[in-house]
Interface confidence: low
């Protein structure tokens, strides 16, 4: 997704925001969390 | 290292009120979801509620919603659980723990005890 | 809710054995990114519960290469491949897929 619908996604999930760091490991992709966002965005 | 100590716990009676504090150390607080999770004595574990890095976000358990409100200061790393009209089976060690992606319950802390007695 | 349940609800195993666990949901834990969020926990007796498997099968970091997990769907598995000591406890899967999250109800190993 392009900035603009990423940063909404973000500002509406639940759960972490983009500046998650990593804490021993990671636990999922960048990826993921871009797929995570948009799964609450479309589940509200 | 990464940290979470609950605080606040105690006895109450029925009806009335009791605020938990959980305070962070360790990682970027303002970057994570925040869950508490209960367990009754010599029971299972319910989750309760989640709150998002940012606040603006929350969900709740059937069981405690409109009587608990969870609440978070990015400020002094501090997430809180507002318990009202607290109930005989809301009795058990309240836990705070950070949310990964996924919610992931990654960092657990090591639990206050909530007593409702009469 | 998606009800989580555990087989056995308790296991002694003997020292240096293997140990499974498994745990069923009612519906399938597959989300609509694919993932599939159903996480083990580990309680020692005194302790807060501990991040052992996340996502089915992945450690989190600083657990031991023993404990794995696997499965799909609605039926999952956690396995000890040589049980130890500090292994005895209480151990949890949880479902973090749809609200409200749900845990099973727990599975106590303990040594025979």
């Known amino acids: 997704g392009g900035g603009g619908s990423k940063h909404k996604c973000v500002q509406n999930s639940l759960v972490n925001n983009e500046t998650l760091e990593s804490i021993m490991n990671t636990l999922e992709s960048e990826e993921d969390f871009r797929k995570y966002f948009y799964y609450l965005e479309g589940s509200k | 290292q990464v940290q979470l100590v609950e605080s606040g716990g105690g006895v109450v009676q029925p009806g009335r009120s009791l605020r938990l504090s959980c305070a962070a150390s360790?990682?970027?607080?303002?970057?994570?979801?925040m869950h508490w999770v209960r367990q009754a004595p010599g029971k299972g574990l319910e989750w309760v509620a989640v709150i998002s890095y940012d606040g603006n976000n929350k969900h709740f358990a059937d069981s405690v919603k409109g009587r608990f409100t969870i609440s978070r200061d990015n400020s002094k790393n501090t997430l809180n659980l507002q318990m009202n009209s607290l109930r005989a089976e809301d009795r058990a060690v309240y836990y705070c723990?950070?949310?990964?992606?996924?919610?992931?319950?990654?960092?657990w802390g090591q639990g206050t005890m909530v007593t409702v007695s009469s | 809710d998606i009800v989580m349940t555990q087989t056995p609800l308790s296991s002694p195993v003997t020292l240096g054995q293997p140990a499974s666990i498994s745990c069923r949901s009612s519906?399938?834990?597959?989300?609509?990114?694919?993932?599939?969020?159903l996480s083990w926990l580990q309680q020692r007796p005194g302790q807060p519960p501990r991040l052992l498997i996340y996502?089915?099968?992945n450690r989190f970091s600083g657990v031991p290469d023993r404990f794995s997990g696997s499965g799909a769907g609605t039926d999952f598995t956690l396995k000890i491949s040589r049980v130890e000591a500090e292994d005895v406890g209480i151990y949890f899967c949880m479902q973090t897929t749809q609200f409200p999250f749900t845990f099973g109800p727990g599975t106590k190993v303990d040594i025979k």
């Open positions: 519906q399938s834990l597959v989300r609509s990114d694919g993932n599939t969020y």
């Open positions: 723990a950070r949310g990964a992606s996924g919610f992931v319950l990654d960092i």
């Open positions: 996502k089915i099968s």
């Open positions: 360790g990682f970027t607080f303002s970057s994570y979801g």
